[in-house]
């Protein structure tokens, strides 16, 4: 069975955060799709959509996220780029597909956002996270305003953290350091 | 220590299919996208396409798309790699590799390699 | 879809030799760009990701730069376990290609 899980990002205020949803590409390909910020005790807030129809690996941005949708595959790319602390939060990818609920997607994102000067050398940062190129064309999308109501907005408690992170090479990638941890619904 | 382990050579007849198999072992095998690489006798190397063994979705390239199927097995951290209607273009060696980092990270660095499978294709 | 092309397709260097490989992309791919090397037989080991970050257990003679369209690999002082070819690869965007390789002989 598919496990809806947390991955932990941690990164320094002006790195860039990019990772990718996989989506079912014979259902979604051309679906309409958002990334959401979902705050502890609220519903979860739509950040930026693509367009409808999601055109294939069309860039769209909206302030400093950028989508990349790659229908041919089945991939959401999501980046938020120059990132600032008070961007710390759970993320999820959600497939809009009218007049149904959004389709939430695997897997949810953690991001840790800390203070301090990033790209230092002999600093774990020197990695693409710091690079960012602007597309060279982006657009801006209208998103739905609605959410689901029944989507889970509350953090697993500590006790449930399963940290698999069986080979200890992950630390050494320089992409973050990424915690998988279960979420119960 | 991580491992993937690729199922034997084959020897197939034009418009026949193969199914090559990839056992992971020393980690979680739903934390790490696995991808499909050939290489043609003497060639370079080819990417095929990706799977996420956690919600089993793959994508492929356009070359392939029609005719690859990535599928797992969640119980016995297996995962599969068919390709249909076969030509003598398509003997090559193919690899199944895991990426330095977990699925959703955009960090497409081939870390950990299968020993690879010899699909012969002739008549 | 992004071109990688490598130079040289093959060279032929000394023991104790610097040996630089170029790749160049046919667009801008930042930093998002790997290097493998494949010994006869056997499957391709990543030697550098991110375009400079020297993977775990990689002697520190190999090395990686560059960004933008232009890499560069270099191993220091080559050694005779070295002789492979060398693959570039880049993941900017989908689908990833890989540069046509660099075989490396000792003379």
């Known amino acids: 069975a598919t496990k809806l899980t947390e991955e932990k990002y941690e990164l320094k205020e002006g790195q860039t955060l990019d990772v990718k949803c996989d989506y079912t590409l014979e259902k979604f390909a051309s679906s309409q799709k958002a990334w959401q910020i979902i705050r502890d005790g609220e519903m979860p807030k739509t950040l930026a959509c693509t367009e409808r129809p999601s055109k294939n690996s069309h860039p769209v941005q909206v302030g400093r996220i950028i989508l990349e949708d790659y229908h041919d595959h089945g991939l959401l790319r999501v980046r938020m780029v120059n990132l600032q602390v008070e961007d710390s939060g759970l993320y999820q990818c959600v497939i809009y597909q009218p007049p149904k609920e959004p389709h939430m997607l695997f897997d949810r994102i953690r991001l840790v956002v800390t203070k301090g000067f990033s790209g230092t050398p002999g600093s774990n940062e020197n990695s693409t996270q710091n690079v960012y190129k602007i597309p060279p064309t982006t657009t801006k999308a209208l998103c739905p305003l609605y959410t689901s109501p029944r989507t889970v907005t509350q953090a697993p408690p500590k006790s449930t953290a399963d940290v698999s992170t069986p080979d200890s090479e992950i630390n050494l990638t320089n992409v973050t350091d990424i915690i998988r941890v279960p979420v119960f619904n | 220590q991580v491992q993937l382990v690729q199922s034997g050579a084959e020897v197939k007849k034009p418009g026949a299919s193969v199914k090559v198999s990839c056992k992971a072992s020393?980690?979680?095998?739903?934390?790490?996208?696995i991808n499909w690489v050939r290489q043609a006798t003497g060639q370079g190397l080819e990417w095929m396409g990706w799977?996420?063994?956690?919600?089993?979705?793959?994508g492929s390239v356009k070359k392939f798309r029609d005719r690859v199927t990535m599928t797992r097995n969640t119980s016995i951290s297996t995962a599969y790699m068919e390709l249909s209607s076969l030509r003598s273009e398509d003997t090559a060696v193919y690899y199944c590799?895991?990426?330095?980092?977990?699925?959703?990270?955009?960090?497409?660095?081939?870390?950990?390699w299968g020993q690879g499978t010899l699909v012969t294709v002739s008549s | 879809d992004i071109q990688m092309t490598q130079s040289p397709s093959s060279l032929s260097a000394s023991v104790g030799d610097r040996v630089t490989i170029t790749c160049q992309a046919s667009?801008?791919?930042?930093?998002?760009l790997n290097w493998y090397q494949q010994k006869p037989g056997k499957a391709p080991k990543l030697q550098i990701y991110?375009?400079?970050n020297l993977e775990t257990g990689v002697p520190s003679r190999f090395s990686g730069s560059g960004s933008g369209t232009d890499f560069t690999f270099t191993i220091s002082s080559l050694q005779p376990e070295d002789i492979a070819t060398y693959y570039c690869?880049?993941?900017?965007?989908?689908?990833?290609?890989f540069g046509q390789g660099t075989r490396l002989e000792i003379k």
């Open positions: 667009r801008d791919i930042s930093k998002y």
């Open positions: 020393g980690y979680t095998f739903t934390s790490y996208d």
């Open positions: 690869q880049h993941y900017d965007n989908i689908p990833i290609t």
């Open positions: 590799v895991r990426l330095i980092g977990y699925s959703s990270a955009w960090k497409w660095s081939f870390q950990h």
């Open positions: 991110d375009a400079s």
């Open positions: 799977m996420n063994p956690n919600s089993g979705n793959s």
